[in-house]
Interface confidence: low
């Protein structure tokens, strides 16, 4: 589709190699050497078969919603640089990425940037911070299970220790203690009661479960598993899941412009 009458301004895509830990954001910058009047900028990932899968796009001063809301494109104030970010990168986001620009008619042309490689590394265990970060994707080694079991064991040991200390300090108080509310004072949902909210982390990759192909649910374009993690006293963040047919939320864009299609 290249035509000789309109020289193409090159694209850059940087950094050429990017390494982030899982759960962190990974950001590439796609830069146009100059700004054509009318263009579409696409962000692609190379599939194992060397095909380009379109992740998201920028066209005519609007961001085209990606098929996965984790992939975001943002135009920078200078007009020629675009941040292409993966929010909360997963291990399986590792791969080759590039951006591609399409001049719109009458002189339709396509140009691709050089490839860049993203490596998403397994998160190293760190002391917990104030705000919980998205949980790392559970690896085939059942890393999460190991951590969970360890946490439970430590918790049980601490409880036993606490019980022992209480028994030693208050020997009478521990005898015949009732853990339920008294009849004349029912449990109240007042300021003292700590409400339990759910914090939805969205889609997690449960690798140890073999997914069997089955017909998708009528309104969900993809069968995904949702993980809801419970925290005390945190505001709820409901998982929003718009189906393609409801025409709300992220819509599936046409893949016809990947690469070099549409009409836009």
């Amino acid at each position: 589709l290249d035509s000789p009458d309109r020289p193409w301004s090159p694209l850059t895509f940087s950094p050429a190699q990017l390494t982030v830990q899982e759960g962190e954001n990974a950001t590439f910058t796609c830069s146009l050497a100059d700004i054509p009047d009318s263009f579409v900028l696409n962000w692609y990932r190379l599939s194992p078969r060397n095909q380009t899968d379109k992740l998201a796009a920028f066209q005519e001063d609007r961001i085209e919603p990606g098929r996965d809301r984790r992939f975001r494109v943002m135009r920078l104030p200078n007009g020629r640089d675009f941040h292409m970010s993966i929010v909360a990168a997963r291990l399986n986001d590792s791969g080759i990425y590039l951006c591609g620009a399409i001049y719109l008619p009458p002189n339709t042309q396509i140009n691709e940037s050089p490839r860049a490689e993203l490596s998403v590394t397994e998160r190293t265990l760190e002391p917990p911070t104030q705000s919980p970060s998205p949980p790392p994707r559970l690896s085939g080694q059942l890393q999460g299970l190991v951590i969970g079991v360890t946490s439970v064991l430590v918790g049980v040991l601490l409880l036993l220790l606490l019980t022992w200390v209480l028994a030693a300090v208050f020997p009478r108080a521990t005898r015949g203690a009732c853990v339920c509310g008294s009849e004349d004072e029912p449990l109240k949902e007042g300021p003292d009661a700590a409400p339990v909210f759910t914090l939805d982390y969205g889609e997690l990759d449960f690798q140890w479960r073999e997914k069997t192909p089955e017909p998708p649910a009528p309104c969900a374009p993809e069968q995904t598993e949702y993980a809801t993690i419970v925290f005390p006293g945190r505001p709820a963040s409901p998982g929003r899941r718009a189906s393609a047919s409801s025409l709300q939320g992220a819509q599936p864009p046409s893949p016809e412009d990947g690469p070099g299609l549409w009409p836009l």
């Epitope: 990606g66 008619p105 599936p252 864009p253």
Partner: antibody, heavy 120, light 111 residues
Framework: EVQLVQSGGDLVKPGGSVRLSCVAS????????LYWVRQAPGKGLQWIGG????????NFSEKFKSRATLSVDKAKNTAYMQLNSLRAEDTAVYYC?????????????WGQGTLLTVSS | DIVLTQTPPSLSVSPGEPASISCRAS??????????LHWYRQKPGQPPQLLIF???NLESGVPDRFSGSGSGTDFTLRISRVEADDAGVYYC?????????FGQGTKVEIK
Amino acid sequence: EVQLVQSGGDLVKPGGSVRLSCVASGYTFTSYYLYWVRQAPGKGLQWIGGVNPSNGGTNFSEKFKSRATLSVDKAKNTAYMQLNSLRAEDTAVYYCTRRDSNYDGGFDYWGQGTLLTVSS
Amino acid sequence: DIVLTQTPPSLSVSPGEPASISCRASKSVSTSGFSYLHWYRQKPGQPPQLLIFLASNLESGVPDRFSGSGSGTDFTLRISRVEADDAGVYYCQHSWELPLTFGQGTKVEIK
């Protein structure tokens, strides 16, 4: 009510040209791409090309690139397809159809079709 | 070009019976949760009618006897209980890349 009303089908001699029209109503004209699909007698569906009414941008099947011209008249909510250098094998019913420009949900409305016969 | 192969080429079904049509693409038309494959029915002398879009989503006004499934290269259109009105030619179509192509069609007749 969404409608795509077609006209322009005719009996044309080989080597001639034809201009088919597709008048759209009942929706915002510039919010949907318009495509042309043809169907030879007793055969399947074949995509010809598409036009973006908001800016006149077009794309084509390689087979029709050199002979087909797609255009729109926004004031009349009308899309046109001109097909040149007609041959007997261009005899077919020609359909215009639309697709939402914001997302790809397939071709949700079709014109009634117009028959083009190429014969000497 | 992506080639869509439909099977069977024709199908004869009794009213009330289920029916299913397969469409196989020469390369994957799916990514990140969306499959760019659509199903149409065409009755004699009429334009095609969209039944299912994006592989599994029922177009408004289409009876829920129709359902679509599949991803990657293999897709299926199912009619849970065929009615006399379902006779016609069924086509799959992809919109993954240019050129857009259709399957060759499956003719469904009612016994």
